[in-house]
Interface confidence: medium
Amino acid sequence: PEPPTACREKQYLINSQCCSLCQPGQKLVSDCTEFTETECLPCGESEFLDTWNRETHCHQHKYCDPNLGLRVQQKGTSETDTICTCEEGWHCTSEACESCVLHRSCSPGFGVKQIATGVSDTICEPCPVGFFSNVSSAFEKCHPWTSCETKDLVVQQAGTNKTDVVCGPQDRLRA
């Protein structure tokens, strides 16, 4: 019979014959012959292959480096790569999430408009009149000044964008 010029799905052409590809999670040890099947071996620990293949080497699982702010989100298997994500307080620097950076903190006088996510940084906004923030934080919004009136007190010291108002007792009229 004529040697094949194309092979079925999950096969590959070598030496004018069709051999079975190795299944995901296995690598090629030796091609098939007239008399023998393709020989495959499972990937070792911390290795994977995610497709039907004829690779002689498995790929190393991705390494989630804590010094780059990364941690394992999903442990790799012989058929899947490890998925890394950013640690609490960090976000990815790229779509591939190969490294992370610390979330920005909003300085005193600024509050958090939008809390950072794993992929986006903190968005800060200046505290408007009547609001303040006295901390550097990646979570705290601007807080409203204390209302002295509702406590039957008077303002002794005006508030700023970084400090709350200071309330004090009302001066009693002397008899």
Partner: antibody
């Protein structure tokens, strides 16, 4: 943080040291082991992070094992095939990774245990 | 391999004076700021002074100041006091993760 007693060991012996922590949780902080040879600099041995994942200095990888017991708040360093070059004061320290709430800091060790002297001699 | 090179020992300063110790890394530290400074006195464990290259650790006097990024870092002590006589170490964190300590710089007060 406080290390267990060191002592005198013979070459080829296995060293086991325990670090007991209090006042904070091993589920938030990493713990590192660092050593200092007499009159010498400091050398990072390795760390165990809040997930229980271990990391080692290249030189220590083949003969060091760090484990933890979160119920007992202890972290253990086991080092095999001791030689005279392993004579040092061994410290455990909190760090280098901490993540939690509004704080995330990395790359530093604080506080440190008082250290324990390990002497390897025949 | 990563190497941290510190100012050669000893460095001396008068009481009230200023000392600057440098720490040079053979390659950039992680995040450009995984660099911390420690003070160590004989018979004691190291004490953290500065982390993140420039952030003062809790309870450390403001006369200690850290600076730098990437591969070049400095620790400056202004208004030297007798109690500041000690050996100072820098530590770098690198992808890997790897942590390397500098050789230490002894500071003596005249």
């Amino acid at each position: 943080v406080k290390e267990s007693e060191g002592g005198l060991f013979k070459p080829t012996d296995t060293l086991t040291l325990t670090c007991t922590v209090s006042g904070f949780s091993l589920s938030s902080y990493a713990i590192s082991w660092v050593r200092q040879a007499p009159g010498n600099g400091l050398e990072w041995i390795g760390a165990i992070d809040r997930y229980g994942t271990t990391y080692y200095a290249t030189w220590a990888k083949s003969r060091s094992t760090i484990t933890r017991n979160t119920n007992e708040n202890t972290v253990t360093l086991k080092m095999t095939s001791l030689t005279a070059a392993d004579t040092a004061t061994y410290f455990c320290a909190r760090g280098p990774w901490y993540y939690g709430g509004d704080v995330a800091w990395t790359g530093s060790f604080d506080p440190w245990g008082p250290g324990t002297l390990v002497t390897v001699s025949s | 391999a990563q190497v941290l090179t510190q100012t050669a020992s000893p460095v001396s300063a008068a009481v009230g004076g200023t000392v600057t110790i440098s720490c040079q890394s053979s390659q950039s530290v992680a995040n450009n700021d995984f660099l911390s400074w420690y003070q160590q006195k004989p018979g004691q464990p190291p004490k953290l002074l500065i982390y993140g290259a420039s952030t003062l650790a809790s309870g450390v006097p403001s006369r200690f100041r850290g600076n730098g990024s990437g591969t070049q870092f400095t620790l400056t002590i202004t208004g030297m006091q007798c109690d500041d006589a000690a050996t100072y170490f820098c530590t770098g964190g690198y992808a890997g993760p790897i942590y390397i300590f500098g050789g230490g710089t002894e500071v003596v007060v005249k």
